[in-house]
């Protein structure tokens, strides 16, 4: 997606992108797991939520996340008919009023309680590098993706399109 110039073209476009509708175009309730089939789980500890990446026991129930999909205009130089340049952005909410947020300063992924309209830190560009896997790229920091680091979710910088296929930024969605 980034070509020879890395993320430069894309960085400008993402910062300029705007969500075209305030309501989501579609929503899914799904469990989130890593490329290696570890589950993403959420636990309430000391009045705040922690996010874990772990192997579940055989019959343990997977946590569900509400993924809300928004269309976003992608400014581009392509000579389209106004239709081109749409991206899908998602917000991820494991429980009412809490959303995953990108903390770019700490390179961390956190759960924050907030009201709508959600801040840009809660929006992630949806990528399908493989048909059954998705990646989530920070709207606020193009080229930075949600990934797995030391059994936690973290923000991981991806500097070329080849690295978009690295397993630690690939996730599986399961609606069952």
């Amino acid at each position: 997606a980034f070509g020879i110039s890395g993320v430069q073209k894309y960085t400008r476009a993402l910062h300029d992108s705007s969500i075209t509708g305030i309501s989501p175009i579609t929503e899914y309730l799904a469990s989130l797991s890593t490329y290696n089939d570890q589950s993403i789980t959420f636990a309430l500890e000391d009045e705040s939520y922690e996010i874990y990446v772990e192997d579940l026991k055989k019959d343990e129930k997977k946590d569900k996340v509400l993924l809300s999909y928004y269309e976003s205009q992608h400014p581009s130089n392509e000579s389209g008919d106004g239709v081109d340049g749409k991206m899908l952005m998602v917000t991820l909410s494991p429980t009412k009023d809490f959303w995953l947020h990108a903390n770019n300063k700490e390179h961390s992924v956190e759960l924050h309680k907030c009201e709508k309209p959600l801040p840009d830190q809660a929006f992630f560009v949806l990528h399908n590098m493989h048909s059954n896997c998705v990646s989530f790229e920070c709207k606020t920091d193009p080229g930075v993706f949600i990934g797995v680091k030391d059994n936690h979710l973290a923000l991981i910088k991806v500097d070329s399109s080849e690295n978009l296929c690295t397993e630690n930024i690939l996730f599986k969605l399961s609606e069952t």
Epitope: A1, G3, I25, T26, Y28, H74, S76, E78, S79, G80, V83, D84, G85, K86, M87, L88, V125, L126, H127, N128, M129, H130, S131, V134, S161, L164, C165
Partner: antibody, heavy 122, light 107 residues
Framework: QVKLLQSGAALVKPGASVKMSCATS????????VSWVKQSHGKGLEWIGE????????NFNENFKGKATLTVDKSTSTAYMELSRLTSEDSAIYYC???????????????WGQGTLVTVSS | NIVMTQSPKSMSISVGDRVTMNCKAS??????LAWYQQKPGQSPKLLIY???NRYTGVPDRFTGGGYGTDFTLTINSVQAEDAAFYYC?????????FGGGTKVELR
């Protein structure tokens, strides 16, 4: 403007293979999933599969696994589909299509090529 | 695979009529549904996606509705150029499947 230009009609013998092309222009080829759709009188519209030029990842309808092979040439922004071991059941119009979204496949077909007619006959 | 069933198979209408066609999914598909129009000798064209979102450039006389298993495409005040086949398609999940189509012809 977005264009998907497909190769011309093909008349092929049973048991043979055919490879058709879909030359694209007007958009960033590597950033969109390309799908192929079959239209026949007997079965209507059927999705064959899709390919993402950026990663080379593909995804097939089970009914077409082993029948269709999808490839791309990023240097010419062209997608290809090869159909093997052809029978009369494969006689149809084949369309290449593209979705509305950068980077993501929702298997929605926003742009279509003009179609390639394949006739299998001895 | 989820089966998409369209009804009626064909309908004969007059210019200015309001027409509604149906698409039924064999399982709940949420709002993961698209509608296409295909005129003779042409490729299909996307009209509606995610059940009710009109695609860019599609006239506002085309309206999609429904959720779950039952969906409709309505054409308000049909124009002569609307004579075509209309197909519904389940989107998002693989494999996407199409309905058999509804033929709309002018009287």
């Amino acid at each position: 403007q977005v264009k998907l230009l497909q190769s011309g009609a093909a008349l092929v013998k049973p048991g043979a293979s055919v490879k058709m092309s879909c030359a694209t222009s007007g958009f960033s080829f590597t950033d969109y999933w390309v799908s192929w759709v079959k239209q026949s009188h007997g079965k209507g519209l059927e999705w064959i599969g899709e390919i993402y030029p950026n990663s080379g990842a593909d995804n097939f309808n089970e009914n077409f696994k082993g029948k269709a092979t999808l490839t791309v040439d990023k240097s010419t922004s062209t997608a290809y589909m090869e159909l093997s071991r052809l029978t009369s059941e494969d006689s149809a119009i084949y369309y290449c299509t593209r979705g509305p979204y950068y980077y993501s496949t929702q298997i929605i077909f926003a742009y279509w090529g003009q179609g390639t007619l394949v006739t299998v006959s001895s | 695979n989820i089966v998409m069933t369209q009804s009626p198979k064909s309908m004969s209408i007059s210019v200015g009529d309001r027409v509604t066609m149906n698409c039924k999914a064999s399982q709940n598909v949420g709002n993961n549904l698209a509608w296409y129009q295909q005129k003779p000798g042409q490729s299909p064209k996307l009209l509606i996606y995610y059940a009710s979102n009109r695609y860019t450039g599609v006239p506002d006389r085309f309206t999609g509705g429904g959720y779950g298993t039952d969906f409709t495409l309505t054409i308000n005040s049909v124009q002569a150029e609307d004579a075509a086949f209309y197909y519904c398609q389940r989107i998002y999940n693989s494999p996407p499947t199409f309905g058999g189509g509804t033929k709309v012809e002018l009287r």
